[in-house]
C-alpha cells in the first residue's frame, strides 16, 4: 500500500481466483484513543472499533472510503482505492490502446517546436467518475523539472455503438534547451482513477521524436505565362522554432484531386516556393518535416488550383 | 575550416557535408526510429556518447558570439563516431557490406572532421568507451543506439552548420 | 495488367513527319499522365512532353517546342507522339511512359523505332 | 536544365558482388530523384522513387540515397539479371532530365 496523495491510498494486488489479498492497517488520525469506531462509504454498519482498524482487501466490494467517528462526529477518512496486477502485468482497463506507432500505446504526445512544450492525449470509453493526474519530468534517476497543467476533456467522438473520449494535457519543460541534442528522454506519467480503481500509464520519448510542425501557412499561387505551372509559395509556420535558418524544414508539395486515386503532381523541396501543374478540380497543397531528422510530418496546407 | 587558432570553416561544404551525413545516417537504419531503444536499459552504452549539451554554444546567438566552442563539440563527436563506426561493433558478426550506408557515414564523418580540423592542429578529443559485446544479438542493438543517437547528433550538426552557411559565411 | 502497346518502326525522310501511336490498357486512359521519352542508338534518355489525356492538357521539353505535338484520344485510349521537320539526329527509339505521377514513369511501351535516313 | 551527372559510365563486377552507383545534380534537387534499370533492347523500370522510396515488386537488394545533389543506388549482392544500364532522372523541375547512364558489366 502507498499513498497516492493526502488520505488516498493505492492497494497493490495480484488479481487471481481465490487470491489472498492484501492486509491493511487503516490509523485513525486523531489523538482520540477511545470510543472510534469504523464505516466504509455510506454505509452505516460498523466494521470495527478502535484507533486502528485491520482488513484483508480483495476484491473491489474491500475499496472505498473507510471513515473513523467518534460520538457521530466525524474524525478522518482514508480512501482506498485498487491497482490491479494480473499474470504480472497491472491493468490497463481505463485507457484505450491507441496502437500507433506500436501496441500498448496508451498516451501519445506531440510538440509543434522544440521550445520545450508538448501536448499530450489520451483516448476513454468511460464518462463518469473519472480523474486524472499527470506528473512529468526530463530524466528518472536525477529529473529535471517539467510542469504540466489539468488533464482535460478535448474531445468527444463516436465510433460505432461507442462513445469515445479524449483528454489531453500540456507540459513545457522548465529550463528547455532547444539548440541542444537530448540525452535524457522526457518521461510522462497519468494516474488514472475511475471509481476505486487505480492504473498508472507512462510515456518516455525525446522532444526530437515528436515533433510535428504546424501545417505551412499563407499559401499562395501565381499562374506562369504560357505555361500549365503554377509557382505556388509559403511561409513557416508561427509556431515553429527560430531562427529559421537554424531550425529549418523541408517540404512536399502536391496537386491531387478530390479522390486520392486520381493522379497527382508531387515535389519535395527545402526552399518555400515550388513550381507545379494545376489542374481544373484540383487543390495544391503543401506539408513541412524538420529538415535534419526524420519526425512526423504535419498535417497539409490546401488552396484550390482555380 | 575550424582550426584551433579561431578562424573561420567553409560554412557551405560542411553544411553539405552534415545534411549528407542526416541522410545517410537515416538511411544506415530507417526503421532504427520505430523501435523503442529506451526499453532496452541502454544507460551503461550510450550515455557516453558526447552529446551537444546546453552549453557548447551549438545555439544560434553562441555561434555568433564565438562559433568555436561549439565546432570544437562537433569536432569531438565526429572523431567519437568515427571511431565507433570502425569499432568491432560494426566490424564484427553479423558483418556489414563494405558499401553499406554504414560505410558511407563512417567516410563522411572523417571528412567533416577533416573539414573542421585540417592536419597539424589539435584539439583534445574524447576517449571511445571500451563497449565490446559479446553476442551478435548484443552488438545488433548497440548498433541500432548508437546509429540513432548519431542521427541525433547530426541533426544538431547540420543545423549548426546551415545557420552558420546563412549567418556567418564571410 | 496496365500495358502501353506501340505502333511500328518507321523510315522517314530528313523534313518529314512522324506520328506514332501508343495504346493503354488494364486501366482508365484518363487516370494517368502520358509521356514521350526517346533514345538515340548507344545513347542516353531523353524527354520529350507529357500530356494529360483528361484535359489535353501539354508540356514539351523547350528543345522540341514547336516541332512536336503530343494528342490523346480517350475514345480509342491511345496517346500520339508527332515530331515535324525530322532530321538524322531524329533517329531514335520513342517510348511512350504513364503514371499518376506526373514526374516519374511507371509503365512503359516497348518502343517505336524512327529511322530518319535520306 | 538541371544536368545530371553518372558515374561511372560503366563498372564491372560479378555475381555476389555490392554495386554503388552515384548521381549528381547541377543544383539542389531535394529527393527529386529516380532510378531506372535498361536492359538491351528493352524499355527501362522503375526501380527506386524519391531518392530512397522502394517500389513494389522491385527486389530489397536494390536500394538507393541521398539529397540535395548528390545521390546513390546500391545493388546488394549481385544477380545475373541485374546486369544492365541504370540512370537516374531528376523530377525537381521541367524539362525532366536523366543522367547519362551506367552500365553494370559482367566481369
Known amino acids: 500500500i502507498w499513498e497516492l496523495k493526502k488520505d488516498v491510498y493505492v492497494v497493490e494486488l495480484d488479481w487471481y481466483p481465490d487470491a489472498p489479498g492484501e492486509m491493511v492497517v487503516l490509523t485513525c488520525d486523531t489523538p482520540e484513543e477511545d470510543g472510534i469506531t469504523w464505516t466504509l462509504d455510506q454505509s452505516s454498519e460498523v466494521l470495527g472499533s478502535g484507533k486502528t482498524l485491520t482488513i484483508q482487501v480483495k476484491e473491489f466490494g474491500d475499496a472505498g472510503q473507510y471513515t473513523c467517528h467518534k460520538g457521530g462526529e466525524v474524525l478522518s477518512h482514508s480512501l482506498l482505492l485498487l491497482h490491479k496486477k494480473e499474470d504480472g502485468i497491472w491493468s490497463t482497463d481505463i485507457l484505450k490502446d491507441q496502437k500507433e506507432p506500436k501496441n500498448k500505446t496508451f498516451l501519445r504526445c506531440e510538440a509543434k517546436n522544440y521550445s520545450g512544450r508538448f501536448t499530450c492525449w489520451w483516448l476513454t470509453t468511460i464518462s463518469t467518475d473519472l480523474t486524472f493526474s499527470v506528473k512529468s519530468s526530463r530524466g528518472s534517476s536525477d529529473p529535471q523539472g517539467v510542469t504540466c497543467g489539468a488533464a482535460t476533456l478535448s474531445a468527444e467522438r463516436v465510433r460505432g455503438d461507442n462513445k469515445e473520449y479524449e483528454y489531453s494535457v500540456e507540459c513545457q519543460e522548465d529550463s528547455a534547451c532547444p539548440a541542444a541534442e537530448e540525452s535524457l528522454p522526457i518521461e510522462v506519467m497519468v494516474d488514472a482513477v475511475h471509481k476505486l480503481k487505480y492504473e498508472n500509464y507512462t510515456s518516455s520519448f525525446f522532444i526530437r521524436d515528436i515533433i510535428k510542425p504546424d501545417p505551412p501557412k499563407n499559401l499562395q499561387l501565381k499562374p506562369l505565362k504560357n505555361s500549365r505551372q503554377v509557382e505556388v509559395s509559403w511561409e513557416y509556420p508561427d509556431t515553429w522554432s527560430t531562427p529559421h535558418s537554424y531550425f529549418s524544414l523541408t517540404f512536399c508539395v502536391q496537386v491531387q484531386g478530390k479522390s486520392k486515386r486520381e493522379k497527382k503532381d508531387r515535389v519535395f523541396t527545402d526552399k518555400t516556393s515550388a513550381t507545379v501543374i494545376c489542374r481544373k478540380n484540383a487543390s495544391i497543397s503543401v506539408r513541412a518535416q524538420d529538415r535534419y531528422y526524420s519526425s512526423s510530418w504535419s498535417e497539409w496546407a490546401s488552396v484550390p488550383c482555380s | 575550416r575550424a582550426v584551433p587558432g579561431g578562424s573561420s570553416p567553409a560554412w557551405t561544404q560542411c553544411q553539405q557535408l552534415s545534411q549528407k551525413l542526416c541522410t545517410l545516417a537515416w538511411s544506415a537504419h530507417p526503421l532504427v526510429g520505430h523501435m523503442d531503444l529506451r526499453e532496452e536499459g541502454d544507460e551503461e552504452t550510450t550515455n557516453d556518447v558526447p552529446h551537444i549539451q546546453c552549453g557548447d554554444g551549438c545555439d544560434p546567438q553562441g555561434l555568433r558570439d564565438n562559433s568555436q566552442f561549439c565546432l570544437q563539440r562537433i569536432h569531438q563527436g565526429l572523431i567519437f563516431y568515427e571511431k565507433l563506426l570502425g569499432s568491432d561493433i560494426f566490424t564484427g558478426e553479423p558483418s556489414l557490406l563494405p558499401d553499406s550506408p554504414v560505410g558511407q557515414l563512417h567516410a563522411s564523418l572523417l571528412g567533416l572532421s577533416q573539414l573542421l580540423q585540417p592536419e597539424g592542429h589539435h584539439w583534445e578529443t574524447q576517449q571511445i568507451p571500451s563497449l565490446s559485446p559479446s553476442q551478435p544479438w548484443q552488438r545488433l542493438l548497440l548498433r541500432f543506439k548508437i546509429l540513432r543517437s548519431l542521427q541525433a547528433f547530426v541533426a544538431v550538426a547540420a543545423r549548426v552548420f546551415a545557420h552558420g552557411a546563412a549567418t556567418l559565411s564571410p | 495488367e496496365v500495358q502501353l502497346v506501340q505502333s511500328g518502326a518507321e523510315v522517314k525522310k530528313p523534313g518529314a513527319t512522324v506520328k506514332i501511336s501508343c495504346k493503354a490498357s488494364g486501366y482508365t486512359f484518363s487516370d494517368y499522365y502520358l509521356h514521350w521519352v526517346r533514345q538515340a542508338p548507344e545513347k542516353g534518355l531523353e524527354w520529350m512532353g507529357w500530356?494529360?489525356?483528361?484535359?489535353?492538357?501539354?508540356e514539351y521539353a523547350p528543345k522540341f517546342q514547336g516541332r512536336v505535338t503530343i494528342t490523346a484520344d480517350t475514345s480509342t485510349d491511345t496517346g500520339y507522339l508527332e515530331l515535324s521537320s525530322l532530321r538524322s539526329e531524329d533517329t531514335a527509339v520513342y517510348y511512350c511512359a504513364a503514371n499518376k505521377e506526373l514526374r516519374y514513369f511507371d509503365v512503359w511501351g516497348q518502343g517505336t523505332l524512327v529511322t530518319v535516313s535520306s | 536544365d538541371i544536368q545530371m551527372t553518372q558515374s561511372p559510365s560503366s563498372v564491372s563486377a560479378s555475381v555476389g558482388d555490392r554495386v554503388t552507383i552515384t548521381c549528381r545534380a547541377s543544383q539542389s534537387i531535394s529527393i527529386n530523384l529516380h532510378w531506372y534499370q535498361q536492359k538491351p533492347g528493352k524499355a527501362p523500370k522503375l526501380l527506386i522513387k524519391f531518392a530512397s522510396q522502394s517500389i513494389s515488386g522491385v527486389p530489397s537488394r536494390f536500394s538507393g540515397s541521398g539529397s540535395g545533389t548528390d545521390f546513390s543506388l546500391t545493388i546488394n549482392s549481385l544477380q545475373p539479371e541485374d546486369f544492365a544500364t541504370y540512370y537516374c532522372q531528376q523530377s525537381n523541375s521541367f524539362p525532366l532530365t536523366f543522367g547519362g547512364g551506367t552500365k553494370v558489366e559482367i566481369k
Open positions: 500530356i494529360d489525356p483528361e484535359n489535353g492538357d501539354t
